[in-house]
Interface confidence: low
C-alpha cells in the first residue's frame, strides 16, 4: 500500500494565531485529531469537507482541527492571538509568484501580460470555452483569476475580457525571480521552499525524514519559519533539508540581488588594525598565521582544496591571502601554504579592546579619553577642529577644547548615549562610537520613572479654531511599505522625518520602501485622494540597543487636513501612572487579512516596578522603556503595528511617548506592553533633526 504523503510543508504556519469569522455566512468544519499533520493531510485532499480547504487551525489544547474555506487574506475574517492555536494557510493561495509552470498557482492576479482584464471562468462572455469550474475540480477556477489548470508551458493564463483577444498568459513571476539574497544569504528571510533540483524542503520544526539540530526554538534569530530555505551555518548560499529520504539537504536557487551588499543589521564592525569580537569584520592585511607561516590565496586551490572562495563568499572580502573570518570561527584564519598544515588562526592580530587603551566609558562618557576614532558603522572620525562650527550650532556652551584632540571619539555635548564623532560623510554627519559602558558602571538615571518630575508636554497648546482643536485626526500615522505591502507603522514627527522601529527594515535597499501618509485604509485602493506616497532617502539607526530608527523622507511631507506631525515629549520626562494612552496600527497585514482600516487600542500608563510585577518579575525595565497596560483584555499592539506610536495626552497636547517594537508578545492578557520610551531618546532625535540635512521640497 502506498504511504500517504505528509502535506504539512504545503502550509505557512502562524504560531499562536487563529482566524475569527466576522461574516457568519462563512462555513467551517471541526474534528478531534492528534496532530497538525492530520489536519494538513485532510485539508490538502479536501476529504469529507463541503468546501475547498484553504487553511486550518490546530487547537493544541483541545486536540482539534478547524478547517476553513478562507484564509487570512479573505474578507469577513480577522486574525486573533491565542496561545493554544496554530494557524496553517495553504501557500498556494497566498503566493504571488509561481513555481515551474504555475499549475498550483491559486493567487488573485486577474490581468494578462498586456494589461487586459481576465474574463470570469464561469462566464461565456465574450469567449465561449469548456474550462468550467465544475469540470476542473481542485484547479480553483474561481472569479477571473489567472490559472494553469492543464499545466501548459506558458504558465497561468485566462480568457480575456477583450473580444479580440481570446486568451493570454498572465505576467506572474517565478518565485525564484521574485526574491533575491545578498552575500551568502545569511540574512535571507524569503519564502523559497524548494531546492534547486525541485525537491520540497522539510519543515525546520520537523525531524522527519531527516533529524537535525536546527530547531526554531533553539535558534530564534535564524528565521526558521515553515520550510523556507535558510543559511544558518555559513554555507555559500541558502539550503534546506529535503523531503526526499535519500537527499539529506540541497542548496536552493535564489538569485543574488543587484545591490549585493549586506543588511545594516548584519554588517560586522569593520576594523583594519585589530579584531573586534570574533574578527568577522577584520579587513586588514595580515597574511600569516600565528607562527609566521604564510597564508594560501583564497582564490587558489593549492596546496589545499576548499570552497571558501571569493565567489562563494561574496561579502567576506576574501582578497589576496589576508586573514579573514568568513564562517564565524573564533577568530580570523586562513589556509596555509604549508601542505601539512591545512588551516591556522591569525591570533597575533591584537584585540581592539586592548589596542585602544581606555575601551569603555563611565556615566555618559563625557570624560572618555580613549583613542578610538571609528564610528559604529566603520567610518573614520574626522578632526574635531574641522567641525567646531557644527558643534557650536547644537550646544549652548563652550566645549572643552583640551578634550577634543585629533579625531578621537568624545562626548562634548553631554549626549546621553555615549561618545561620538563627526565623520566627514555628508550623509552621516556624525555617529556614535562602538564603545561600551565599563563593567559595573550603573546606567545614569534621568529621573525616578514612577514619580513624575518633568512634564512631558511642552508649554505650547494646540491652536484652537472656533473651539475645535485642529488636526484631531491621526494624520501623523505612517504606513511603511516594503515592496508595495504594509510592513510597519511610524510617526511623522517632522515634515521630513518618521520615527519607527529598526526591525521594520528587512532589506538594505531603500528603493524597497515607501511611506504612505494621510491614509486610514492600508489597502492599495485608488480612491484615496488624501494619500501622500513618499520615498525613503535615509535610515538613521538609534543609539545602541534602542531599536529606534529615524527614517528620512526623500522630500518633505505636505502638511494638510490629512497629514500632520505629532509632538515629541521633553527629554527625560515621565507621565503619571494611569494616564490614558492609545496605540495605533494596521495590524499584521503581510497577508492583507482584514478591512485594512487603522485600529486603535486604549492603554494606560503603568509604572516600571508594577509593570515588572505583572511580568512575574521576569522582565526588569530600564529607563529606556515605558509600560502600558490594556483597558480591554487582550488588546494591544502586534506584528505589523511595529514602529507605530504609543500616544498620550498631557495638558491638551498629544505626544508620541512610546514606539512599538517586537519581542514582548502580542496583546497577552494581564501582561502590559513594553515600549521604547521616546522621552529617553528625545535629545538624540532632536540632534539628528538638527544636524542631518533635509531634502528641499
Amino acid at each position: 500500500q502506498r504511504k500517504r504523503r505528509n502535506t504539512i510543508h504545503e502550509f505557512k504556519k502562524s504560531a499562536k494565531t487563529t482566524l475569527i469569522k466576522i461574516d457568519p455566512a462563512l462555513k467551517i468544519k471541526t474534528k478531534k485529531v492528534n496532530t497538525a499533520d492530520q489536519c494538513a493531510n485532510r485539508c490538502t485532499r479536501n476529504k469529507g469537507l463541503p468546501f475547498t480547504c484553504k487553511a486550518f487551525v490546530f487547537d493544541k489544547a483541545r486536540k482539534q482541527c478547524l478547517w476553513f474555506p478562507f484564509n487570512s487574506m479573505s474578507s469577513g475574517v480577522k486574525k486573533e492571538f491565542g496561545h493554544e492555536f496554530d494557524l496553517y494557510e495553504n501557500k498556494d493561495y497566498i503566493r504571488n509568484c509561481i513555481i515551474g509552470k504555475g499549475r498550483s498557482y491559486k493567487g488573485t492576479v486577474s490581468i494578462t501580460k498586456s494589461g487586459i482584464k481576465c474574463q470570469p471562468w464561469s462566464s461565456m462572455i465574450p469567449h465561449e470555452h469548456s474550462f468550467l469550474p465544475s469540470s476542473y475540480r481542485g484547479k480553483d477556477l474561481q472569479e477571473n483569476y489567472c490559472r494553469n489548470p492543464r499545466g501548459e508551458e506558458g504558465g497561468p493564463w485566462c480568457f480575456t475580457s477583450n473580444p479580440e483577444v481570446r486568451y493570454e498568459v498572465c505576467d506572474i513571476p517565478q518565485c525564484s525571480e521574485v526574491e533575491c539574497m545578498t552575500c551568502n544569504g545569511e540574512s535571507y528571510r524569503g519564502l523559497m521552499d524548494h531546492t534547486e533540483s525541485g525537491k520540497i524542503c522539510q519543515r525546520w520544526d520537523h525531524q522527519t525524514p531527516h533529524r537535525h539540530k536546527f530547531l526554531p526554538e533553539r535558534y530564534p534569530d535564524k528565521g526558521f519559519d515553515d520550510n523556507y530555505c535558510r543559511n544558518p551555518d555559513g554555507q555559500p548560499r541558502p539550503w534546506c533539508y529535503t523531503l526526499d529520504p535519500h537527499t539529506r539537504w540541497e542548496y536552493c536557487a535564489i538569485k543574488t540581488c543587484a545591490d549585493n551588499t549586506m543588511n545594516d543589521t548584519d554588517v560586522p564592525l569593520e576594523t583594519t588594525e585589530c579584531i573586534q569580537g570574533q574578527g568577522e569584520g577584520y579587513r586588514g592585511t595580515v597574511n600569516t598565521i600565528w607562527n609566521g607561516i604564510p597564508c594560501q590565496r583564497w582564490d587558489s586551490q593549492y596546496p589545499h582544496e576548499h570552497d571558501m572562495t571569493p565567489e562563494n563568499f561574496k561579502c567576506k572580502d576574501l582578497r589576496e591571502n589576508y586573514c579573514r573570518n568568513p564562517d564565524g570561527s573564533e577568530s580570523p584564519w586562513c589556509f596555509t601554504t604549508d601542505p601539512n598544515i591545512r588551516v591556522g588562526y591569525c591570533s597575533q592580530i591584537p584585540n581592539c579592546d586592548m589596542s585602544h587603551g581606555q575601551d569603555c566609558y563611565r556615566g555618559n562618557g563625557k570624560n572618555y579619553m580613549g583613542n578610538l576614532s571609528q564610528t559604529r558603522s566603520g567610518l573614520t572620525c574626522s578632526m574635531w577642529d574641522k567641525n567646531m562650527e557644527d558643534l557650536h550650532r547644537h550646544i549652548f556652551w563652550e566645549p572643552d577644547a583640551s578634550k577634543l584632540n585629533e579625531n578621537y571619539c568624545r562626548n562634548p555635548d553631554d549626549d546621553a548615549h555615549g561618545p561620538w564623532c563627526y565623520t566627514g560623510n555628508p550623509l552621516i554627519p556624525w555617529d556614535y562610537c562602538p564603545i561600551s559602558r565599563c563593567e559595573g558602571d550603573t546606567t545614569p538615571t534621568i529621573v525616578n520613572l514612577d514619580h513624575p518630575v518633568i512634564s512631558c508636554a511642552k508649554t505650547k497648546q494646540l491652536r484652537v479654531v472656533n473651539g475645535i482643536p485642529t488636526r484631531t485626526n491621526i494624520g501623523w500615522m505612517v504606513s511603511l511599505r516594503y515592496r508595495n505591502k504594509h510592513i510597519c507603522g511610524g510617526s511623522l514627527i517632522k515634515e521630513s522625518w518618521v520615527l519607527t522601529a529598526r526591525q521594520c527594515f528587512p532589506s538594505r535597499d531603500l528603493k524597497d520602501y515607501e511611506a504612505w501618509l494621510g491614509i486610514h485604509d492600508v489597502h492599495e485602493r485608488g480612491d484615496e485622494k488624501c494619500k501622500q506616497v513618499l520615498n525613503v532617502s535615509q535610515l538613521v539607526y538609534g543609539p545602541e540597543g534602542s531599536d529606534l530608527v529615524l527614517m528620512k523622507l526623500a522630500r518633505p511631507a505636505v502638511l494638510d487636513d490629512f497629514v500632520s506631525t505629532i509632538d515629541l515629549p521633553n527629554y527625560g520626562c515621565t507621565i503619571p501612572e494611569k494616564t490614558s494612552c492609545s496605540v495605533y496600527g494596521w495590524g499584521y497585514t503581510g497577508l492583507i487579512n482584514y478591512d485594512g482600516l487603522l485600529r486603535v487600542a486604549h492603554l494606560y500608563i503603568m509604572g516600571n516596578e508594577k509593570c515588572s510585577q505583572h511580568h512575574r518579575g521576569k522582565v526588569t525595565l530600564n529607563e529606556s522603556e515605558i509600560c502600558a497596560g490594556a483597558e480591554k483584555i487582550g488588546s494591544g499592539p502586534c506584528e505589523g503595528d511595529y514602529g507605530g506610536p504609543l500616544v498620550c495626552e498631557q495638558h491638551k497636547m498629544r505626544m508620541v511617548l512610546g514606539v512599538i517594537v517586537p519581542g514582548r508578545g502580542c496583546a497577552i492578557p494581564n501582561r502590559p506592553g513594553i515600549f521604547v520610551r521616546v522621552a529617553y531618546y528625545a535629545k538624540w532625535i532632536h540632534k539628528i533633526i538638527l544636524t542631518y540635512k533635509v531634502p528641499q521640497s
Epitope: G115, I116, P163, N484, N535, R555
Partner: antibody, heavy 123, light 113 residues
C-alpha cells in the same frame, strides 16, 4: 509633488530615429504603484497613446505603431525614454510623457502629464 | 482596438449655462467584477497638457471644481459642466483604459456663446 519633463531634439530627419527622455522628479520611477506612458498629439488633432512601461520591466505599445517603438528606463537617473524609428512627416507631433496610478491590479487614468515637447520631422 | 466617439465636435454655451458632452465606446468598458467603468475625462487648454478631471467615469479628481461631473455606464458616458465659467473654455477628451491600447475620443471644443 511629482513632475515630468520631456526633453529631446525638436527636429528629426525622415527615416531617422526620434529619441525623447522623460525625467521624473519628486517621486521614484521604481514605485510599484505607477505605469509610465508616452502619448502624442498631432498638430490641431486628438491624442494618441504610444505605449507604457512598468518598473518591473513590462512594456506594451500601440500596435498601430508596429515595431517602431522602444520604451526603456534608467532607474538610476529616474528617467524613461522613447525611441521611434523610421520616422516620417506623419510623426510630427507634441510628445507627452504621463503617469497613471495603475499599480499591479488594474489600469487607471493619467493623473500627471509633462508639459510636452514639439517634434518636427523634416529634411 | 476600442474606438471612442465624442459628440458634438464643438459646443457653444452661454456663461452660467449647462454644457453636456457625450462619449460612446465601441465596446463596454464596464468590468463586472468590480462594477467600475474604465473611462476618464480630460480638459486641455491651448499650449497646455491635458488635465485629468474625472476617472472611473464619475469620480472627480481632487482639486476639480464640483461643477464638473461624469455619468454613464457600459458604452455611453456624459461629461456635464453644470454652470459654464470663462476658464472652462477648452477641448475635452474622453479616454478608455479598459483594454490596451488605451484610446481617446477625438475631442469636443467648448466655447462661450
Amino acid at each position: 509633488q511629482v513632475q515630468l519633463k520631456e526633453s529631446g531634439p525638436g527636429l528629426v530627419k525622415p527615416s531617422q530615429t526620434l529619441s525623447l527622455t522623460c525625467t521624473v522628479s519628486g517621486g521614484s520611477i521604481s514605485s510599484g504603484v505607477y505605469y509610465w506612458s508616452w502619448i502624442r498629439q498631432h498638430p490641431g488633432k486628438g491624442l494618441e497613446w504610444i505605449g507604457y512601461f512598468y518598473y518591473s520591466g513590462n512594456t506594451y505599445h500601440n500596435p498601430s505603431l508596429k515595431s517602431r517603438v522602444t520604451i526603456s528606463v534608467d532607474t538610476s537617473k529616474n528617467q524613461f525614454s522613447l525611441k521611434l524609428s523610421s520616422v516620417t512627416a506623419a510623426d510630427t507631433a507634441v510628445y507627452y510623457c504621463a503617469r497613471d496610478r495603475s499599480g499591479y491590479d488594474h489600469p487607471d487614468a493619467f493623473d500627471i502629464w509633462g508639459q510636452g515637447t514639439m517634434v518636427t520631422v523634416s529634411s | 482596438d476600442i474606438v471612442m466617439t465624442q459628440s458634438p465636435d464643438s459646443l457653444a454655451v452661454s456663461l452660467g449655462e449647462r454644457a453636456t458632452i457625450n462619449c460612446k465606446s465601441s465596446q463596454s468598458v464596464l468590468f463586472s467584477s468590480n462594477n467600475k467603468n474604465y473611462l476618464a475625462w480630460y480638459q486641455q487648454k491651448p499650449g497646455q497638457p491635458p488635465k485629468l478631471l474625472i476617472y472611473w467615469a464619475s469620480t472627480r479628481e481632487s482639486g476639480v471644481p464640483d461643477r464638473f461631473s461624469g455619468s454613464g455606464s457600459g458604452t455611453d458616458f456624459t461629461l456635464t459642466i453644470s454652470s459654464l465659467q470663462a476658464e472652462d473654455v477648452a477641448v475635452y477628451y474622453c479616454q478608455q483604459y479598459f483594454s490596451p491600447p488605451w484610446t481617446f475620443g477625438q475631442g469636443t471644443k467648448v466655447e462661450i456663446k
